[in-house]
């Protein structure tokens, strides 16, 4: 969480941003809030990116003002207009690109004053893993698959019964480049699994951490997946 203040003494307003991550090819949100102001026509929202000459987005007098927008963001940005009234200046970024990563500034002007805060935006690919029993294998085997990751993650297996055990000797992980030549499909196989145990396949890079759990008993198979973005710090 980053909290910024205006620089002009009593004419300063608090602006708050939250560091976040974008999943390439999907839509992302750059979070920014400010002290709401009753005079809506005075509210100006500017999004800037370090190293980019033009604006990422500008909203003023109740509408988008995109004449100064940088080419790389053309047609890809929007604020939530009806949320500006409650102090939400968050930016929706469509079709996130790897090159969208960087430091952004959310700059706000209201009738009460000015303020800004920076936001670190990471980009990559992350997806939920699915763990299944591989019935084609010769021994009891689990297969963990996640369709899109970037940068290349690490994969670690764990089990509820053998806590702390190292499964690197009895597992095999491969990374297969997807058709767009950036993201990769992650496939990890765990051999010699025992029944009545819960196994977890944990995939992690510097952007996200995802876990796929599977519990295999005589009568049923239970699955659960969880994905968590890392470094979501507010500013």
């Amino acid at each position: 969480l980053i909290i910024g203040f205006g620089i002009s003494g009593r004419h300063s307003i608090t602006v708050t941003t939250v560091a976040s991550a974008g999943n390439i090819g999907e839509d992302g949100i750059l979070s920014c809030t400010f002290e709401p102001d009753i005079k809506l026509s005075d509210i100006v929202i500017q999004w800037l990116k370090e190293g980019v000459i033009g604006l990422v987005h500008e909203f003023k007098e109740g509408k988008d003002e995109l004449s100064e927008q940088d080419e790389m963001f053309r047609g890809r940005t929007a604020v939530f207009a009806d949320q500006v009234i409650v102090g939400n200046a968050s930016l929706r970024l469509k079709n996130v690109q790897l090159t969208d990563a960087g430091t952004y500034k959310c700059y706000i002007i209201t009738s009460k004053g000015k303020g800004n805060a920076n936001l670190e935006y990471k980009t990559g690919a992350f997806s939920m893993p699915e763990v299944n029993v591989d019935y084609n294998a010769s021994s009891e085997t689990l297969r963990c698959e996640a369709p899109r990751w970037f940068p290349q993650p690490t994969v670690v297996w764990a089990s509820q019964v053998d806590q702390g055990a190292n499964f690197s000797e009895v597992s095999n992980t491969s990374f297969e480049l997807n058709s767009e030549n950036v993201t990769m499909k992650v496939v990890s196989v765990l051999y010699n699994v025992t029944i009545n145990n819960t196994y977890s396949c944990m995939i992690e890079n510097d952007i996200a951490k995802a876990t796929g759990d599977i519990k295999v008993t005589e009568s049923e198979i239970k699955r659960r997946s969880h994905l968590q973005l890392l470094n979501s710090k507010a500013s």
Partner: antibody, heavy 116, light 107 residues
Framework: QVQLVQSGAEVKKPGSSMKVSCKAS????????ISWVRQAPGQGLEWMAG????????HNAQKFQGRVTITADKSTSTAYMELSSLRSEDTAVYYC?????????WGQGTLVTVSS | EIVMTQSPATLSVSPGERAALSCRAS??????LAWYQQKPGQAPRLLIY???TRATGIPDRFNGSGSGTEFTLTISSLQSEDFGAYYC?????????FGPGTKLEIK
Amino acid sequence: QVQLVQSGAEVKKPGSSMKVSCKASGDTFSSYAISWVRQAPGQGLEWMAGIIPVFGTAHNAQKFQGRVTITADKSTSTAYMELSSLRSEDTAVYYCTRGGPYFDYWGQGTLVTVSS
Amino acid sequence: EIVMTQSPATLSVSPGERAALSCRASQSVSSNLAWYQQKPGQAPRLLIYGVSTRATGIPDRFNGSGSGTEFTLTISSLQSEDFGAYYCQQYKKWPFIFGPGTKLEIK
């Protein structure tokens, strides 16, 4: 000096509609949102709906969804609130107010009585 | 939808004394909270917004505090004109919900 002047008291039959007007003066009408807040006899304040002329958007409280329509005429600096399918529980004083997010100027209120 | 609650429902205080009115939100509203005063037969009047900023013309005996979900309006030395109903209101999210109110009466 900002002023919000509302239309006069009305008596309505159950099932009918009401339309209250609110004329603003003293500041740029479209620079602010206009909200409608009602107060039933002896009860508290209830936010009904808001319109943001500069954004061209309106929001209603869930409770009034489908029954309330708010509009704004920028040329005359007047906001309107229409409530349909009236019932006795809609008997209240209806206020127009400047805002949100908070409400700094209020109209004098319009008493609407719904009675058969 | 955010639910606002106020306590007490009625508060009896003598003129010159201090009054503390409480407002609670069902989830965090950050600093997006306002207080209003209403006297019988009159429209409400904005007292405070942004938790603690007094609206134009509001005397400094009115003070707001709190953050997140717990808020207090304190009137340091009650004057006869301060008696009436007080409402808190959140503006973190649509819809803009008011609390049920606290009636401040003369003891």
